[in-house]
């Protein structure tokens, strides 16, 4: 317990102190006082440095004194032989004696009193930063006007913190500017603007004078700017050393001004303003921005339009433009949206053709369609090359998005017909010589394939059977062979409207307009043994002249047998119609004059006994195309004749081309169109 005074006596005082003793006294007076220790008697064995016996005075870690020997007072009016004064409120006194004393020593007597200390003057370190005021038992610090005492009750500072600036423009200066700023202060200013605005600080060099850095480059007084995780500074020295315009990229800025005890200068003054937060001027790849600006700032909205061939995709849908807003955080909204190449997808397949697997289906990619050659060709032109267009479609320069159409090549036999072995007016033939040849089994007759869906034949062949069974692709019409050939199923039979239907067809003498079309249920697949014959053109090039040669083929009657099993063919010249008129009808069913001859009929034959006969009806009279020698067209159809082995009459197909085209057009499926 602290006391204001007290007495200390060596052991056994005033008797001699014992040997080998160590005793200590802890003196404590109240806080704010020092200790004055007075020795009134001292009689301790003397030794060098008081090594044997001694009284030691210790203050904290410091030895204030060590006494031994004998002392007497120099002042007759005072008993004090030694005194100590310390400005602290604690003191320790230690007495030690060794194992022997050569004489009898009586020790020491002392007392202490608590004395007031002047904290303002008694210490090397001044306790107050500004004014120190001593009083008995303590002191207090005080400050000049406009300063305040910090919580440590020792340091004075100016009240320069806690200001929050929210206006979009403002000015801030150090305390007392331009007079010297206060020492030993920490000033904090906060700028807090609306989100979307960045604080921009502007300083002039001449508006800044802060105590310069030490030799190590450390600022003794400093100005620091803190914006989020970015720091500008510390700055110090004569004239502002930093950038005169500081764009903080933040709506919140803390300004911290720290000063030490010395070296006050005039300080600093700055201006700040809020700039709308800028957004980067990065253009989304493959796009254009509207409006175009040199700088985009908070709340600016741009329309981003993808370039042709690019789109923004989300799930299964896409868009070519979107809006983006410069946001309060300095970033664009919708920055995830990217203009990516349009994907045209896997190209559609086409009938009788193919498209190679594309390396890419993205904008600008190119694909090529081809037809199954040599049996099909591209009818609607365009070359088959398509590119992936900006609208996501595969587009051809000629056809646009329309797909190419592979249609059968007409009139080209895989093997040309050669008359090798003479067989009474004709030769054996192979179906590859006449791939357009169609076999009708009831009645036994022929026809000509003119495209995937249509067979051309004579009207008299189908007038009695509107659901004929037809076959293609076989040279032999033996039952076993037909089973392996392609059977065609009719959908509808179209007989020319000018063909007169009779009650008794056997008595017919008028074969005018002997032409019919059979529409098939399913398309015919073309190949080496099945392909169509061309139709005649409408120009005068396709007008037949006497002597023009044509080929006939069929499984009709020969000189040896009523029906042929294998295909026969012959090459015949066109003859004047009168030649046919002059031949006597073999088995007339009426008067010879009753037989009708019209310009819709072609007369051909008369050479070497080559002629068509019963069972060949409806087959084509194939003539080489005058404009393309590789092709044959159906100039005629086997119709009737006065006598086998002489001249025969053929329906003149050229006169019916309009009817054929109209009938096919009006009865086509959407797929064919």
């Amino acid at each position: 317990e602290p006391t204001m005074y007290g007495e200390i006596l060596s052991p056994n005082y005033p008797q001699a102190y014992p040997s080998e003793v160590e005793k200590s006294w802890d003196i404590e007076v109240p806080e704010g006082y020092g200790i004055h220790l007075y020795f009134t008697h001292l009689d301790i064995e003397l030794s060098e440095n008081c090594a044997y016996d001694s009284v030691q005075i210790i203050s904290g870690d410091t030895e204030e004194g060590r006494l031994c020997g004998q002392r007497s007072s120099n002042n007759p009016h005072s008993p004090i032989v030694e005194e100590f004064q310390v400005p602290y409120n604690k003191l320790q006194v230690i007495f030690k004696s060794d194992f022997s004393n050569e004489e009898r020593f009586t020790g020491f007597a002392a007392y202490y009193v608590a004395t007031d200390i002047n904290e303002c003057t008694d210490f090397v370190d001044v306790p107050c930063s500004h004014f120190c005021n001593n009083f008995i038992g303590g002191y207090f610090c005080s400050c000049p006007p406009e300063y305040f005492l910090h919580d440590d009750m020792k340091n004075c500072g100016v009240n320069c913190s806690g200001d929050v600036f929210t206006a979009l423009i403002g000015e801030i200066a150090s305390p007392n500017y331009p007079k010297p700023y206060p020492e030993n202060s920490r000033c904090e200013y906060q700028i807090r603007l609306e989100k979307g605005f960045q604080v921009v600080v502007t300083l002039r060099r001449e508006d800044f004078d802060v105590e310069a850095a030490d030799s190590a480059g450390n600022c003794l007084d400093s100005l620091v700017f803190v914006a989020g995780d970015r720091q500008f500074g510390p700055y110090c020295g004569h004239g502002f050393p930093g950038p005169l315009n500081i764009e903080t990229k933040s709506n919140a800025l803390d300004i911290i001004f720290q000063t030490d005890l010395t070296g006050q200068k005039k300080g600093w003054k700055l201006r700040y303003h809020g700039d709308p937060m800028p957004c980067p001027k990065e253009i989304t790849a493959n796009s254009v921005w509207e409006p175009a600006k040199a700088k985009y700032v908070f709340r600016d909205v741009v329309q981003i339009t993808c370039l042709d061939g690019f789109e923004v995709v989300e799930g299964r849908v896409g868009a070519t433009s979107f809006y983006s807003t410069c946001q309060s955080n300095g970033k664009w909204s919708n920055s995830k949206l990217k203009c990516q190449p349009v994907d045209c997808g896997i190209p559609e397949s086409i009938e009788n053709g193919k498209v190679e697997d594309p390396e890419s289906t993205l904008f600008g990619s190119v694909i090529r369609y081809t037809c199954e050659e040599p049996y099909y060709y591209m009818e609607n032109g365009g070359g088959g090359e398509y590119h992936c267009a900006g609208n996501g479609s595969w587009v051809n320069e000629v056809l646009g998005p329309e797909l190419p159409k592979c249609v059968p090549v007409c009139g080209v036999p895989r093997e040309p017909f050669e008359e090798k072995q003479r067989i009474i007016g004709g030769s054996d033939a192979d179906i590859k010589n006449f791939p357009w040849q169609v076999f009708f089994d009831n009645p036994w007759a022929g026809g000509a394939l003119i495209n995937e869906y249509w067979v051309l034949t004579a009207a008299h062949v189908v007038e009695g059977n509107r659901e004929p069974t037809m076959y293609v692709g076989s040279t032999s019409v033996q039952t076993s062979r037909l089973a392996k050939s392609k059977m065609l199923t009719p959908e509808h039979v179209f007989i020319h409207p000018g063909w007169k239907l009779l009650e008794v067809p056997e008595g017919r003498t008028n074969f005018d307009n002997d032409i019919a079309l059979v529409r098939l249920k399913d398309p015919v697949k073309m190949g080496p043994t099945v392909s169509p014959i061309c139709l005649p053109g409408t120009s005068s090039d396709y007008n037949l002249m006497d002597g023009d040669l044509g080929l006939i083929s069929g499984w009709g009657r020969t000189e040896k047998r009523d029906r042929a099993v294998r295909l026969k063919a012959a090459r015949l010249p066109v003859a004047p119609l009168r030649k046919c008129k002059e031949v006597k009808v073999e088995k007339p069913t009426a008067d010879a004059e009753a037989y009708v001859f019209t310009p819709n009929m072609i007369c051909a034959g008369g050479e070497k006994g080559m002629d068509s006969c019963k069972g060949d009806s409806g087959g084509a009279f194939a003539v080489q195309d005058p404009n393309d020698k590789t092709k044959f067209y159906a100039a005629g159809l086997v119709s009737w004749g006065p006598q086998c082995g002489t001249y025969g009459l053929y329906t003149r197909v050229k006169n019916y081309v309009d009817w054929i085209m109209k009938t096919m057009q009006e009865n086509s499926t959407p797929r064919e169109d």
Epitope: V301, E314, Y323, T325, Q327, K336
Partner: antibody
Framework: QVQLVQSGAEVKKPGASVKVSCKAS????????MHWVRQAPEQGLEWMGW????????IYAQKFQGRVTITADTSTNTAYMELSSLRSEDTAVYYC?????????WGQGTLVTVSS | DIQMTQSPKSLSASVGDRVTITCRAS??????LDWYQQKPGQSPKLLIY???YRYSGVPSRFSGSGSGTDFTLTISSLQPEDFATYYC?????????FGQGTKLEIK
């Protein structure tokens, strides 16, 4: 297929906080924005804010600024919405939704009831 | 913030009717407007995006039009499953605001 599954209903006292989760499957949330929209009983839809899970950028509606925190955990493909200092008027169904061009997919909703 | 105002607030109609809902923005939102359908107890479903584009799987009887500040959602021939609440939403700039909704009821 794309799915957003939200955490279950919550009952909270005024002043408390609530954290709703939204687990995504069938897509990577880093490739989209994740939004939060709420709907008070018999009321309309109210947009609260969004997060870009790729970089944790967030934008909040001014009304919720300071009370709402939207976060995302890309490792679990989950977005979160935390609303603090709850009041009775915060009683609503909270929806998460994903977007690039539009809000094509929505969670099933989480009912948060604030009652003393 | 951009305010979105829908009209009417509610509307009664019969199956087969042609129905039009309008949405007005307090400022120009170009074509950054979407329409959503919400049935009781369900999450909203996207119908129309960018003012006039039908979202995949949405029946062709739904169509959207408009740009700037005035927009329209049209249902050409109402079906029983169309009775619901419809919301417009602008995605022109944040905050992405919704209209207050239009409740379509059976007459």
């Amino acid at each position: 297929q794309v799915q957003l599954v939200q955490s279950g209903a919550e009952v909270k006292k005024p002043g408390a906080s609530v954290k709703v989760s939204c687990k995504a499957s069938g897509f990577n949330i880093k490739e989209y924005y994740m939004h939060w929209v709420r709907q008070a009983p018999e009321q309309g839809l109210e947009w609260m804010g969004w997060i870009d899970p790729e970089n944790a950028d967030t934008i909040y509606a001014q009304k919720f600024q300071g009370r709402v925190t939207i976060t995302a955990d890309t490792s679990t493909n989950t977005a979160y919405m935390e609303l603090s200092s709850l009041r009775s008027e915060d009683t609503a169904v909270y929806y998460c939704a994903r977007s690039r061009l539009f809000f094509a997919y929505w969670g099933q909703g989480t009912l948060v009831t604030v009652s003393s | 913030d951009i305010q979105m105002t829908q009209s009417p607030k509610s509307l009664s109609a019969s199956v087969g009717d042609r129905v039009t809902i309008t949405c007005r923005a307090s400022q120009d939102v170009r074509t950054a407007l979407d329409w959503y359908q919400q049935k009781p107890g369900q999450s909203p479903k996207l119908l129309i995006y960018s003012a006039s584009y039908r979202y995949s799987g949405v029946p062709s009887r739904f169509s959207g039009s408009g740009s700037g500040t005035d927009f329209t959602l049209t249902i050409s021939s109402l079906q029983p499953e169309d009775f619901a609440t419809y919301y417009c939403q602008q995605q022109y700039t944040t905050p992405y605001t919704f209209g207050q909704g239009t409740k379509l009821e059976i007459k």
